[in-house]
């Protein structure tokens, strides 16, 4: 805590310029005012503050505002904003992308801090949703902004919100996101022709099920290994040989580097050895030729 | 007054780990913002990641995201630094400093750490 | 990131001397930039911190100015202890860079 003390004659701050930088912490406190403070806050980020002197001034600003800064200090806090407690910052209500942006600036190529995730919390819960233009806000400042997300939290994306997310957006999402996501982008997606769609779809496709793989492996789309490697498991188990074939076209070549890994290897599991013969790819571990399949899962349906 | 005491350098293989610690003394460690700077054999400077006072906000030089890791105690008025991975570019002296922003206005005497075969 | 260069990188003068170092930053930097004293085995010591300030406790013979690009570090008479190496390093966008030195010799 500041202590309350005089300000030297001659030194009453009439604007916020570099000669405050010279300033002692108590000559700041005595001699700015908190009102011309707040209304001259984006010279401030210009001007090189120590981090003791931020100090005072945020100090100036939390009295002058016990209920949270108003839009209009926030649009320019600048570097001051890593000052700032994610306490703080729940008293805020940001409601314009170009104050989030502001502040996004300021801590960009860096992770995000606990300030950041409080900020983008606030903004988006004031908005209600995580429109198009926030997410691609957010996914250009981080770009695992997405993937950081509860599957809930996904819930409320609306499907127009998806052509803002880039393939490297979801990179680090795990299956249950991409069950959240993949569904909206299908919708999203859904009036494209076939290799456009393919294209966009890609990336979303480890939350897809087995029947939309089915239909895909009848458009040509030649699926390239890496992305049949992030397929969902369970969606991977019923498709037969030929679809498989259809579906990677000249990339099933690449099945013979991957049959140790999931979810080849347990396709290949399930799949006749005669079958996985007539690709010619050598791959082994197939069901041999006379035995019987039982579809378990079927049969416990069933009972 | 002021003082800074770093140690924990040494020679260390390609891949393997260091953890440095800074000891201050003579200010308000919790009050203050801390940085590692290292010098290499070519005597120029070079930041690599400083931490805010109460350890909340924590940035890297891009060089070592990922695999250095910076760390604080204010009650036992130390600063860490935990290298793993390290390569021969990280060899240099490793020197704490207090970060007041607009400068580091004091450092420690550094502590040597050689990356080598 | 910004790149900071000095020159020159080494100068010889004689005590008493006028000295000049020059710091140019690779884009505008304001006024936050800071200078540095180093001695051999010695850890790095502030002089000078937002372009013109003289750090507490360094003497008066030393003196910054500048903002932008281009920064000036003055040593106005030399004295036997300030022959080491110099550098300036900016603060206005991260990471924080330094310049590569500039050694002051005995002439």
């Known amino acids: 805590e500041v202590e309350k003390t005089a300000c030297p004659s001659g030194k009453k701050a009439r604007e916020i310029d570099e000669s405050l930088i010279f300033y002692k912490k108590w000559e700041l406190e005595a001699c700015v005012d908190a009102a011309l403070l707040a209304t001259q806050m984006d010279r401030v980020n210009a001007i090189p503050f120590t981090y003791e002197q931020l100090d005072v001034l945020k100090h100036k600003l939390d009295e002058l505002y016990p209920q949270g800064y108003p839009e209009s200090v926030i649009q320019h806090l600048g570097y001051l904003f890593l000052k700032m407690s994610p306490e703080d910052i729940r008293k805020w209500n940001v409601t314009s992308l170009e104050t989030l942006k502001a502040l996004l600036e300021v801590n960009k190529g860096h992770e995000m801090s606990p300030q950041v995730a409080t900020l983008i919390d606030r903004f988006v819960k004031g908005r209600g949703q995580l429109d198009k233009d926030t997410l691609d806000t957010l996914t250009a400042f981080y770009p695992g902004y997405l993937c950081s997300l509860s599957p809930e939290e996904l819930s409320s994306v609306p499907p127009s919100s998806i052509w803002a997310v880039r393939p490297q957006d979801l990179d680090t999402c795990d299956p249950r996101q991409l069950d959240v996501l993949y569904p909206k982008a299908r919708l999203a997606f859904q009036n494209m022709n076939g290799s456009e769609y393919f294209v966009k779809i890609q990336s979303f496709l480890g939350g897809a099920p087995t029947e939309d793989l089915k239909a895909l492996s009848q458009q040509n789309v030649s699926m390239d290994l890496a992305t049949f490697m992030k397929l969902r498991t369970d969606a991977v188990l019923p498709l037969t040989v030929a679809e498989v074939q259809k579906l990677l076209g000249p990339h099933v070549e690449g099945l013979k580097a991957e049959e140790r890994h999931r979810p080849v290897r347990d396709w290949i599991l399930r799949q006749r050895q005669d079958d996985l013969d007539t690709l010619g790819l050598g791959l082994q571990g197939g069901i041999p030729n006379g035995y019987l399949v039982l579809d378990l899962s079927m049969q416990e349906a069933l009972s | 007054q002021v003082q800074l005491v770093e140690s924990g350098g040494g020679l260390v293989k390609p891949g393997g780990s260091l953890r440095l610690s800074c000891a201050a003394s003579?200010?308000?460690?919790?009050?203050?913002?801390m940085s590692w700077i290292r010098q290499t054999p070519g005597k120029c400077l070079e930041w690599v990641s400083y931490i805010s006072s109460s350890g909340s906000t924590i940035y890297y030089v891009d060089s070592v995201k990922g695999r250095f890791t910076i760390s604080r105690d204010n009650a036992k008025n130390s600063l860490y630094l935990q290298m793993n991975s390290l390569r021969a570019e990280d060899t240099a002296v490793y020197y704490c400093?207090?970060?007041?922003?607009?400068?580091?206005?004091?450092w420690g005497q550094g502590t040597l750490v050689t990356v080598s075969s | 990131e910004i790149q900071m260069t000095q020159s020159p990188s080494s100068v010889s003068a004689s005590v008493g001397d006028r000295v000049t170092i020059t710091c140019r930053a690779s884009?505008?930097?304001?006024?936050?930039l800071a200078w540095y004293q180093q001695k051999p085995g010695k850890a790095p010591k502030l002089l000078i911190y937002a372009a013109s300030g003289l750090q507490s406790g360094v003497p008066s013979r030393f003196s910054g100015s500048g903002s932008g690009t281009d920064f000036t570090l003055t040593i106005s008479s030399l004295q036997p202890e300030d022959f080491a190496t110099y550098y300036c390093?900016?603060?206005?966008?991260?990471?924080?860079?330094f310049g590569c030195g500039t050694k002051v010799e005995i002439k």
């Open positions: 884009q505008g930097i304001s006024s936050w």
């Open positions: 390093q900016q603060a206005n966008s991260f990471p924080p860079t």
């Open positions: 003579g200010f308000t460690f919790s009050d203050h913002y």
């Open positions: 400093a207090r970060d007041v922003r607009t400068a580091f206005d004091y």
